[in-house]
């Protein structure tokens, strides 16, 4: 069983999923309002968003006393965060600016990918090997959307029997999408295009918030029970509380290299020939050059206009 990394508003903690009744370890303490969290295992980096400080920050696994600001301007409520471990990019949602943005892992070369028809975007999940990203929106028209990680091919994949879609996670091996709905109190799954939808845990969960997966087990945080729960990803059976008495459980991830499988990085050689951003794409050549917001991409599709 994995270590589970979770945000707890005032700190980030790690707990062993097999021994969850034991105390967690504080990885980064003394925070204001940590909400979303993710990591790049191969780089030894942990990222989190702080919604009070309106910032995204990072630290190194083994140097957690040293915290770096990654994005500190233009954020209002960065509720969702995801690291592209292949393309080495950072993606985030902001439910107040109603944007989904991307940048390099250090926060440079920032680009707004989506800013229209977003109401309350929250969880975001990436599948860099296929070039797709997924996000939940619990606004007036709740939905789950999918798009290319380059901002292309945006499509609503779930928009029925959905109210407060909070948690979202991907099963890379089985090619499935899992999500938790805090109003309808369930966990459902579907194919990555939204077809073949099935219930995993039917309407019995008090207030599921964030969701992750490791091997055959789903793990999620619950706001009502202040705990981390788990069940079998196929059947929903074996539902149990594995870590309780959490101050304010927010985002959660299975903290393991297994959750960030290696694959061919189409941007790996010479940044794909791109002068600035090289973003994963679902269509050949499986990457797309892009420019920071406000800077134009030249007709060669590789170079950003001078002054970027």
């Amino acid at each position: 069983a994995p270590l589970l990394l979770y945000a707890n508003r005032r700190d980030l903690r790690l707990v062993d999923a097999t021994n969850g009744k034991e105390n967690a370890t504080i990885v980064v303490g003394g925070l204001e309002d940590a909400a979303a969290v993710d990591f790049v295992f191969s780089h030894g980096l942990i990222y989190w968003s702080d919604v009070s400080e309106e910032a995204i920050k990072r630290t190194e696994f083994n140097k957690t006393e040293s915290v770096q600001n990654v994005v500190v301007s233009g954020l209002l409520s960065p509720d969702g965060l995801a690291c592209d471990w292949l393309g080495e990019k950072l993606y985030w949602t902001d439910s107040e600016t109603n944007r989904i943005e991307v940048s390099n892992l250090d926060g440079s070369l920032r680009k707004v990918l989506f800013w229209q028809e977003l109401d309350q975007p929250r969880a975001i999940a990436l599948d860099p090997s296929s070039g797709f990203m997924y996000w939940t929106d619990w606004g007036e028209v709740p939905k789950i959307e999918r798009a290319g990680m380059d901002g292309s091919s945006r499509f609503i994949i779930i928009n029925s029997e959905i109210y407060w879609p909070n948690g979202l996670t991907l099963d890379y091996e089985e090619q499935k999408l899992y999500w938790a709905d805090a109003k309808l109190n369930f966990i459902h799954k579907s194919n990555l295009d939204g077809t073949n939808r099935q219930a995993v845990v039917k309407g019995s969960l008090p207030h599921p918030f964030a969701l992750t997966l490791f091997e055959d087990i789903l793990y999620w945080t619950d706001w009502s029970t202040h705990s981390i729960l788990a069940c079998n990803k196929y059947t929903g059976e074996g539902l149990r509380e594995i870590h309780s008495d959490i101050f304010s459980p927010m985002d959660i991830h299975a903290f393991s290299q297994q959750r960030q499988p290696n694959a061919t990085n189409p941007c790996g050689i010479d940044n794909g020939g791109c002068s600035h951003l090289c973003l994963m794409s679902p269509v050949k050549p499986f990457y797309q050059c892009a420019c920071p917001t406000g800077v134009k991409l030249l007709e060669n599709g590789k170079t950003c206009k001078d002054g970027a």
Epitope: D11, N23, I26, G29, G30, T64, E65, S66, D245
Partner: antibody, heavy 118, light 105 residues
């Protein structure tokens, strides 16, 4: 075993400053919050604030901002509280306490008595 | 800030008697903590997160409650339980304590 050893009693003049220490032993100092609390004679407890020694982030009760400054020295596993511009209202016993991972104060220092008098 | 009001302020109980101390918050809190303090000593944790017994605390102590109303119960008073008891919340900053209940034998 876990211990928090505080510095001894202090008698200081009004307007002066004082630094109280809290030396931790028996656990990993950098991975637990240290809180500071005030107790005036015959009265209840007041929470001053916390410090997380791992990255020395702090949080203060607004009432004590400008009065108390919390610091920590990782090399000696010691937390400090500096109190400035002292008045008779600051005369009290000050406690440091470790926050257990279930968010309560599981180990306390023995208390440091501060008397402010001319 | 959240104000915690303990009642009674002072009480006495005979050995073997059941004792209940109340703690009322001026707005709803998720959990309550209880500490025991004897004269000249540091406070000692009794109950965490409303109803969990801290390490080494005798089973005669228990906690309950929710929202704005919480209580600490000693099922059978013993001489060593004579002390001052404080409730505490961390629901919002600043973390606050009740004024204390002095329990005499």
């Amino acid at each position: 075993q876990v211990q928090l050893q505080q510095s001894g009693p202090e008698l200081v003049k009004p307007g002066a400053s004082v630094r109280i220490s809290c030396k931790a032993s028996g656990y990993t100092f950098t991975t637990y919050y240290i809180h500071w609390l005030k107790q005036r004679p015959g009265q209840g407890l007041e929470w001053i604030g916390w410090i997380f020694p791992g990255n020395v982030n702090t949080k203060y009760n607004a009432k004590f901002k400008g009065k108390a400054t919390l610091t920590a020295d990782k090399s000696s596993s010691t937390a400090y509280m500096q109190l400035s511009s002292l008045t008779s209202e600051d005369s009290a016993v000050y406690f440091c306490a470790r926050e257990e991972l279930q968010y309560y104060f599981d180990y306390w220092g023995q208390g440091s008595a501060l008397t402010v008098s001319s | 800030q959240i104000v915690l009001t303990q009642s009674p302020a002072i009480m006495s109980a005979s050995p073997g008697e059941k004792v209940t101390i109340s703690c009322s918050a001026n707005s709803s809190v998720r959990f309550m903590f209880w500490y025991q303090q004897k004269p000249g000593s540091s406070p000692k944790p009794l109950i965490y997160r409303t109803s969990n017994l801290a390490s080494g605390v005798p089973a005669r102590f228990s906690g309950s409650g929710s929202g704005t109303s919480y209580s600490l119960t000693i099922s059978s008073m013993e001489a060593e339980d004579a002390a001052t008891y404080y409730c505490q919340q961390y629901h919002s900053y600043p973390w606050t304590f009740g004024g204390g209940t002095k329990l005499e034998i």
